[in-house]
């Protein structure tokens, strides 16, 4: 009778084991072990017992002891079970961002591990078990579906294997995958709201505001504002579940035309976008051209108004004939035209909006000097000793210098309050002088003496 010890062994992969083969007869013709494993016999006294060291055991094996005794041949098997923890425990890759309300499938792949009968795969959210299944197949795969909720944000999902060899007197061997951190998000189906000027003038600044409500987590939302190829740099303010992004936009002549203003909100792996067109226009103020800004009385003056080729102008309230970007008027300069304003108003239609621009120029008319009866009476009669203010106003542009002299030396104090005396009486020559020339006028002062009353 052949016996083997131990009859059952559990050992780590690559390990070694001592196996004893024994026989019940004292003088066996043959006693040995049959195995493909590397073996080394340990020398022992006696004929009916042999000990072998079996090494580098890579997989389950059943070495067989045999003996040949006078009463016949017999065999006995020992069962070697190899154990090893899985090589790889992995959660199938997933996008880190998942929309709330979506079903998320977690798949754990387990490569290797033995004995499979003692190997279990567990899917976890944090420490909470979601699914537990025996490891079957290569790789063993365990899947579960999770309905993504808001409160799953930041949750760690992992996969753990448990090789339970406690029934065999060993321990529980655990392997855990790298965790998958779930980031949940809500991006509403409504596009962001974009408030901006529909038209924008070259070399000016406008303000653009993009906003959206109902986001989670709002702090993770990325906002991209752009006008054509120009990325805008917004200042973003956040609410509980909303944001508002405000940006200044400057445009130059190169931007002229219709540009696309875009606001894109990116959250997780989704985005919402709003497009709007902004018309960039160039519209300089109209040009008012006077033949000369300063002319002498009687000169013919041409006043021209020129504007943007697509504009319509009015000059001093009179529309151009025909309606268009140019208007002009002709006049003979009179003193009344001095300081006269010529106003040109231009109107341009840009993307359905009417844009108005004005320009005003003033005409200076040089005339005079003038001394007339109305402003410089030729005769004054005043009672002696009365208080009087001689008044004589010379007109002209530039304003003339005025002097009134009696006998070429005695001045009449124009504009000053004086006590009338006999000396004041007489004829004065009033002379008004400017760059435009000079005029004279005789003014007579009569003094009424009390004795004549």
């Amino acid at each position: 009778q052949t016996s083997v010890s131990p009859s059952k062994v559990i050992l780590p992969r690559g390990g070694s084991v001592l196996v004893t083969c024994s026989t019940s007869c004292d003088q066996p013709k043959l006693l040995g072990i049959e195995t493909p494993l590397p073996k080394k016999e340990l020398l022992l006294p006696g004929n009916n017992r042999k000990v072998y060291e079996l090494s580098n055991v890579q997989e389950d094996s059943q070495p067989m002891c045999y003996s040949n005794c006078p009463d016949g041949q017999s065999t006995a098997k020992t069962f070697l079970t190899v154990y090893w923890t899985p090589e790889r425990v992995e959660l199938a890759p997933l996008p880190s961002w998942q929309p709330v309300g979506k079903n998320l499938t977690l798949r754990c792949q387990v490569e290797g591990g033995a004995p499979r009968a003692n190997l279990t795969v567990v899917l976890l959210r944090g420490e909470k078990e979601l699914k537990r299944e025996p490891a079957v197949g290569e790789p063993a795969e365990v899947t579960t579906t999770v309905l993504v909720r808001r409160d799953h944000h930041g949750a760690n999902f992992s996969c753990r294997t448990e090789l339970d060899l406690r029934p065999q007197g060993l321990e529980l061997f655990e392997n855990t995958s790298a965790p998958y951190q779930l980031q949940t998000f809500v991006l509403p189906a409504t596009p962001p709201q974009l408030v901006s000027p529909r038209v924008l003038e070259v070399d000016t600044q406008g303000t653009v505001v993009c906003s959206l409500d109902g986001l989670f987590p709002v702090s993770e939302a990325q906002v991209h504002l752009a006008l054509g190829d120009q990325r805008l740099n917004p200042t973003v303010t956040y609410g509980n579940d909303s944001f508002s992004a405000k940006a200044s936009v400057s445009v130059t002549a190169e931007d002229e035309g219709t540009q696309r203003l875009t606001c894109a909100v990116i959250l997780g792996n989704q985005s919402q976008e709003t497009l709007q067109t902004v018309t960039i226009y160039s519209f300089p103020a109209p040009n008012v051209i006077l033949t000369k800004p300063e002319v002498s009385e009687g000169t013919e003056v041409t006043v021209k108004c020129e504007a943007h080729p697509r504009a319509k102008v009015t000059l001093n309230g009179v529309p151009a004939q025909p309606l268009g970007p140019r208007a002009q008027l002709l006049l003979k300069a009179t003193p009344e035209d001095n300081g006269r304003s010529f106003s040109c108003s231009a109107t341009l239609e840009v993307a359905g909006q009417l844009i108005h621009k004005n320009q005003t120029r003033e005409l200076r008319v040089l005339y005079g000097p003038r001394l007339d009866e109305r402003d410089c009476p030729g005769n004054w009669t005043w009672p002696e000793n009365s208080q009087q203010t001689p008044m004589c106003q010379a007109w002209g542009n530039p304003l003339p210098e005025l002097k009134c002299l009696k006998d070429g030396t005695f001045p009449l104090p124009i504009g000053e309050s004086v006590t009338v005396t006999r000396d004041l009486e007489g004829t004065y020559l009033c002379r008004a002088r400017s760059t435009q020339g000079e005029v004279t006028r005789k003014v007579t002062v009569n003094v009424l003496s009390p004795r004549y009353e």
Partner: antibody, heavy 120, light 112 residues
Framework: QVQLVQSGAEVKKPGASVKVSCKAS????????LHWVRQAPGQRLEWIGV????????DYNQKFRGRVTMTRDTSATTAYLELSSLRSEDTAVYYC?????????????WGQGTALTVSS | DVVLTQTPLSSPVTLGQPASISCRSS???????????LHWYLQRAGQPPRLLIY???NRFSGVPDRFSGSGAGTDFTLKISRVEAEDVGVYFC?????????FGGGTKLEIK
């Protein structure tokens, strides 16, 4: 004992397809994955892909994607490699090899190889 | 793809003498679980490759203990303590850390 026996040599014209089989015995078929590797004359060994004999899931080398299909028949304990749109560069010896799915413990048993010649 | 470079290309050795083959990787072969999936194979003329060493230093069953593997990261070595006639053939290193899996160009071991 573990054995992987492959189908015989093939001669194909460019543009054709070939299907090579690999019959497994001596172990529980679904306990191990099967990988396919080829060896062209004067070239290094090249990994083509792997099939899970249990689930039928596959992973292919990007280089062969679109031209390669791996299947298995668990009742026949046989795996198959199909390569389409053949070209002369596909001339090689094709091996199946037993392993874990990700090959972490190496390819422990190999088939004897199937020689494929692609020539017009 | 990860490139495995073997040296020497050919190694003439005297029977009973030691032999050493080097395998260098273009990137580290340490997987995120800390294991290194670098294996060695021997291919005799007209035969398929045969697994000798798995995971850098573990001898596969039936492989004589004169074969040993060592190394870490990107540099690995296969040593034969005393070369025997049956060791003649082409030795390949292979990695299963990065996808797609790749093989070295081979080192031919021949007897002087």
């Amino acid at each position: 004992q573990v054995q992987l026996v492959q189908s015989g040599a093939e001669v194909k014209k460019p543009g054709a397809s070939v299907k090579v089989s690999c019959k497994a015995s001596g172990y529980t078929f679904t306990d191990y994955a099967l990988h396919w590797v080829r060896q062209a004359p004067g070239q290094r060994l090249e990994w083509i892909g792997v099939i899970s004999t249990y689930s039928g899931n596959t992973d292919y080398n990007q280089k062969f994607r679109g031209r390669v299909t791996m299947t298995r028949d668990t009742s026949a304990t046989t795996a198959y490699l199909e390569l389409s749109s053949l070209r002369s560069e596909d001339t090689a010896v094709y091996y199946c090899a037993r392993s874990l799915y990700f090959g972490s413990s190496g390819f422990d048993y190999w088939g004897q190889g199937t020689a494929l010649t692609v020539s017009s | 793809d990860v490139v495995l470079t073997q040296t020497p290309l050919s190694s003439p050795v005297t029977l009973g003498q030691p032999a050493s083959i080097s395998c260098r990787s273009s990137q580290t072969l340490v997987y995120r679980n800390g294991n290194t999936y670098l294996h060695w194979y021997l291919q005799r003329a007209g035969q398929p490759p045969r697994l000798l060493i798995y995971k850098v230093s573990n001898r596969f069953s039936g492989v004589p203990d004169r074969f040993s593997g060592s190394g870490a990261g990107t540099d690995f070595t296969l040593k034969i303590s005393r070369v025997e006639a049956e060791d003649v053939g082409v030795y390949f290193c292979s990695q299963n850390t990065h996808f797609p899996y790749t093989f070295g160009g081979g080192t031919k071991l021949e007897i002087k």
